[in-house]
Interface confidence: low
């Protein structure tokens, strides 16, 4: 038959441990229950009495089961370049998180101590990698045959559009620009939202497909000079 | 000429980890990053992580607890590792180059290495 | 997570017709890429911001699109053109992919 089921408080068997969501009062030597995650320990077990539970006054919490007699304190309201994406509750602490353009440079155990904003990459540069939560942008200079006209975080170097014939040619933060005949489009129209129509690179660099290897497939990369060293990232 | 290979264990037990190397040719990895991607049996791509050209990473922060990337770029080799793996980790495993002139996309693949997680 | 809707996610094309998958992000994003699978292979890249074919792609193949809402055409389908095809973007991590649109000839 199974032993007796015990009530708390109740003496361990020796060299036994408590139950789930209990725990041993060393004062009482008696295994005794935790309060659940939101309360706390008002009152701790005795001999003949269980612990007595209380809920967490207001901006202060417990997240697991315990038996602490004060809840923790929450943390303190979320600066200007955070957003708070968890609150305060009485069985969680509040998180903040930066808000978008920002990322986080110095974490803590749960959201961000320190918020900084994204870089910004300005003309002439693109976004070489994309910031994310908890990293910057990375810029690097427009290669031949690309360009970005925009101080952003998060535009690319673009292929300058193809002409019949070139009125001013591309550089790392100009597009080319066309005579007054519409410009040739070996590809697609760009998408709506760009200032220029992407296509493929200028007429004066010839692009040069990379060896194609099964079963990847390459983009064109652009050959010819490298443009004038203008610093490796921007801000 | 650009190519990736993957190289795994094929089968897995389940709650053990995972380690699969990608060894490049044809391309520096101090110029190109490399991406994991996964795809499980008749489905989708699932983007895992990333290792870029200069050391720096960025995890899929649904699996970061479980996956770690890391390269050897003497020997032109990136390396994942993936813990507790259970059997809906089961599926290809790709390596890829990063296209680092800008167009943010993955420009040769590896073939691809079957990883079945089974007791 | 930026998550990416395809639709639809089958499909069939009689050769000579003209088809349209779409591709749609839960947040907007700066621009769109598509890479096209068959089966037992590798993915392939095949349309990078938003609308230009990586090299080797036939030019029948077109993308457009912005924000939220990005397409993938073929102006007149062809037999080789049976594949998956995924959208994927990079503007926030994770990177994710769409669930794909799977195009089958008829």
């Known amino acids: 038959l199974p032993a007796q089921v015990a009530f708390t408080p109740y003496a361990p068997e020796p060299g036994g441990t408590c139950r789930l969501r209990e725990y041993y009062d060393q004062t009482a030597q008696m295994c005794c229950s935790k309060c659940p995650p939101g309360q706390h320990a008002k009152v701790f077990c005795t001999k003949t009495s269980d612990t007595v539970c209380d809920s967490c006054e207001d901006s202060t919490y417990t997240q697991l089961w315990n038996w602490v007699p004060e809840c923790l304190s929450c943390g303190s309201r979320c600066s200007s370049d955070q957003v708070e994406t968890q609150a305060c509750t009485r069985e969680q602490n509040r998180i903040c998180t930066c808000r978008p353009g920002w990322y986080c440079a110095l974490s803590k155990q749960e959201g961000c101590r320190l918020c900084a904003q994204l870089r910004k990459c300005r003309p002439g540069f693109g976004v070489a990698r994309p910031g994310t939560e908890t990293s910057d942008v990375v810029c690097k200079p427009c290669a031949p045959g690309t360009f970005s006209n925009t101080t952003s975080s998060t535009d690319i170097c673009r292929p300058h559009q193809i002409c019949h014939v070139v009125a001013i040619p591309g550089n790392a933060s100009m597009d080319a620009v066309c005579t007054s005949t519409s410009p040739t489009r070996s590809m697609a129209p760009g998408a709506v939202h760009l200032p220029q129509p992407v296509s493929t690179r200028s007429q004066h660099t010839q692009p040069t497909p990379a060896p194609s290897t099964a079963p990847g497939t390459s983009f064109l990369l652009p050959v010819g000079p490298s443009p004038p060293a203008e610093g490796s990232t921007g801000d | 000429e650009v190519q990736l290979q993957e190289s795994g264990p094929g089968l897995v037990a389940p709650s053990q980890s995972l380690s699969i190397t990608c060894t490049v040719s044809g391309f520096s990895l101090t110029s190109y990053g490399v991406h994991w991607v996964r795809q499980p049996p008749g489905k989708g791509l699932e983007w895992l992580v990333v290792i870029w050209s200069d050391g720096g990473t960025t995890y899929n922060s649904a699996l970061k607890s479980r996956l770690s990337i890391s390269k050897d770029n003497s020997k032109s080799q990136v390396f994942l590792k993936m813990n507790s793996l259970q059997t809906d980790d089961t599926a290809m495993y790709y390596c890829?180059?990063?296209?680092?002139?800008?167009?943010?996309?993955?420009?040769?693949w590896g073939q691809g290495t079957t990883v079945t997680v089974s007791s | 997570d930026i998550v990416l809707t395809q639709s639809p996610s089958l499909m069939s094309a009689s050769p000579g017709e003209k088809v349209t998958m779409t591709c749609s992000a839960s947040s907007s994003v700066g621009y769109m890429y598509w890479y096209q699978q068959k089966p037992r292979s590798s993915p392939k890249p095949w349309i990078y911001l938003t609308s230009n074919l990586a090299s080797g792609v036939p030019a029948r193949f077109s993308g457009s699109g912005s924000g939220t809402s990005y397409s993938l055409t073929i102006s007149s389908m062809e037999v080789e053109d049976a594949a998956t095809y995924y959208c994927q973007q990079w503007s926030s991590d994770p990177f994710t992919f769409g669930s794909g649109t799977k195009l089958e000839i008829k």
């Open positions: 890829a180059r990063h296209d680092d002139d800008g167009y943010y996309a993955m420009d040769y």
